[in-house]
């Protein structure tokens, strides 16, 4: 039961950090227009992934994208491929994670095969996190590095003349999203993980194996030990792992009447 | 068609206060509304904003200590009170509604206050 | 707060003849995100209200004629008639729209010659 849980927690938390991170990836405000000690505007301006906009005390918001490929920055192309990896990873993490999710029974798929699949989505939402998390941190230094340098010359002369004032940018909201949607991934991931050690059919250290002793019919039960020479193995190739424990809803798997030496 | 109809001409004596209102017409009334204010031949000069939304507004520096703008939105009309009435506080009125460019648009036709005792 | 510059004070231009005013700002009015000045034109006609002619620096109003256009950039501006009308006798403002305090240029009184 707890397996479960663990298992269906895990997919709910990812499938939240999944949405958010898609959420984050199409906002606006990954960077907006500093209030702060600068001189106020009767315009708002706003940078996301994809288009910059501007917001006029008027109402009026005009959004202008990024048609151009070659003149981006390489940080911001840096970036859309992470958040955009992310996104990949975490959908087709959801999707295998749905087929592993011990609460649906698709055919005869057994433990192993939903467990190996439980790890795989586990680590692919792990990854996909920290994709998430990578990108806003590379786009939240490169404001801060920004954002000091235009501080410094916060003022540029014109010609000695004139005065213009440089626009600053500071965190928007997506970077906010990204973090705790990045963070969500990485910890459903995790405990998809978990759960996949649960979820693993283990060797147990009394296996019924059948011995035919000559003239008579004896059914002979070893216990104590784990052969390594083929007595107690897995005798339908499921795949083993070690320490996880064993819960109510878990099936033993016990030889079959064919397993006779 | 918009329209921003003001209140009448005010006479006030000096020290006193002046509230004018401003009532809109097939007017958006989500946008900031403006004050202009203009002197005898003179140019003119902004006021101050307040957005009919959220009744937030924005003064200007010169005049902050002394107006005042509120609404009421059941009857879409912002008001503009001035306070501490001088004799150079003699001037026109004028409400102003937001359009693109932070420009304004839509005017209302002015209300002359003139601070005499 | 910013400073708007209007030349000349007065003008006087023969019907049918170019007029052109100047506004020079204290500041630079180009807004970067969208690459647009927020500079506005105004008419004023003795004892109404301005009316709005041009917003974003060159954006004529719908209904204003076409022989009103506005050009310039950052702190320049200019507001040309091409062809001077009866009608055009006013005085001009221009308006920054961009920093608060919003401020309004002196004023430019056109006159017929």
């Known amino acids: 039961m707890a397996v479960t849980a663990c298992q269906g927690l895990g997919f709910v938390v990812s499938l939240i950090g999944i949405a958010g991170i898609i959420a984050a990836t199409c906002m606006d405000q990954w960077s907006t227009q500093d209030l702060y000690n600068n001189p106020v505007t009767a315009v708002f301006n706003y940078q996301g992934l994809w288009r910059s906009c501007v917001r006029e005390s008027s109402g009026f918001t005009e959004c202008r994208g990024y048609f151009t490929l070659l003149g981006l920055p390489a940080m911001l192309q840096a970036v859309r491929a992470l958040m955009i990896v992310g996104i990949v990873l975490g959908a087709i993490g959801l999707l295998v994670s749905i087929f592993a999710l011990k609460c649906i029974r698709i055919g005869s798929m057994e433990d192993s095969a939903k467990a190996n699949m439980t790890l795989t989505s586990g680590i692919m939402f792990i990854v996909s996190g920290l994709c998430a998390i990578a990108g806003v941190s590379v786009f939240a230094n490169m404001l801060v590095t920004n954002f000091w340098m235009s501080t410094a010359n916060m003022y540029t002369g014109m010609g000695g003349m004139v005065q213009t004032v440089q626009t600053r940018y500071t965190f928007g909201a997506a970077l906010f999203v990204g973090w705790v949607a990045g963070g969500l991934t990485l910890i459903g991931g995790v405990m998809m993980c978990i759960a996949c050690r649960g979820l693993a059919p283990e060797e147990t250290n009394y296996k019924a194996v059948s011995y035919h002793a000559s003239g008579h019919s004896v059914a002979y039960k070893p216990g104590g030990f784990k052969a390594s020479t083929g007595f107690g193995s897995n005798t339908k190739n499921k795949k083993i792992y070690d320490g996880g424990a064993r819960t109510e809803d878990e099936v033993q798997s016990y030889p079959s009447k064919h397993d006779y030496v | 068609q918009v329209q921003l109809v003001q209140s009448g001409a005010e006479v006030v004596k000096p020290g006193a206060s002046v509230k004018v209102s401003c009532k809109a017409s097939?007017?958006?009334?989500?946008?900031?509304v403006h004050w202009v204010i203009q002197a005898p031949g003179q140019g003119l000069e902004w006021m101050g904003e307040?957005?009919?939304?959220?009744?937030?507004?924005n003064y200007n520096e010169k005049f902050k200590k002394r107006v005042t703008m509120t609404l009421d939105r059941s009857t879409s009309t912002v008001y503009m009170e001035l306070s501490s009435l001088r004799s150079e506080d003699t001037a026109v009125y004028f409400c102003a509604g937001i359009y693109y460019g932070n420009s304004f648009a839509h005017w209302g036709q002015g209300t002359l206050v003139t601070v005499s005792s | 707060d910013i400073v708007m510059t209007q030349s000349p004070d007065s003008l006087a231009v023969s019907l049918g003849e170019r007029a052109t005013i100047n506004c020079k700002s204290s500041?630079?009015?180009?807004?970067?995100?969208?690459?647009?000045?927020?500079l506005t034109w105004y008419q004023q006609k003795p004892g109404q209200p301005p009316k709005l002619l041009i917003y974003w620096s060159s954006t004529r109003e719908s209904g204003v004629p076409d022989r009103f256009s506005g050009s310039g950039s950052g702190t320049d501006f200019t507001l040309t008639i091409s062809s001077l009308q009866a009608e055009d006798v006013a005085v001009y403002h221009c308006?920054?729209?961009?920093?608060?305090?919003?401020?309004f240029g002196g004023g430019t009184k056109l006159e017929i010659k």
């Open positions: 097939g007017y958006t009334f989500t946008n900031w």
């Open positions: 308006q920054n729209n961009y920093y608060y305090p919003l401020t």
């Open positions: 307040i957005n009919p939304t959220n009744a937030r507004s």
């Open positions: 500041q630079s009015l180009l807004n970067a995100g969208n690459q647009k000045n927020y």
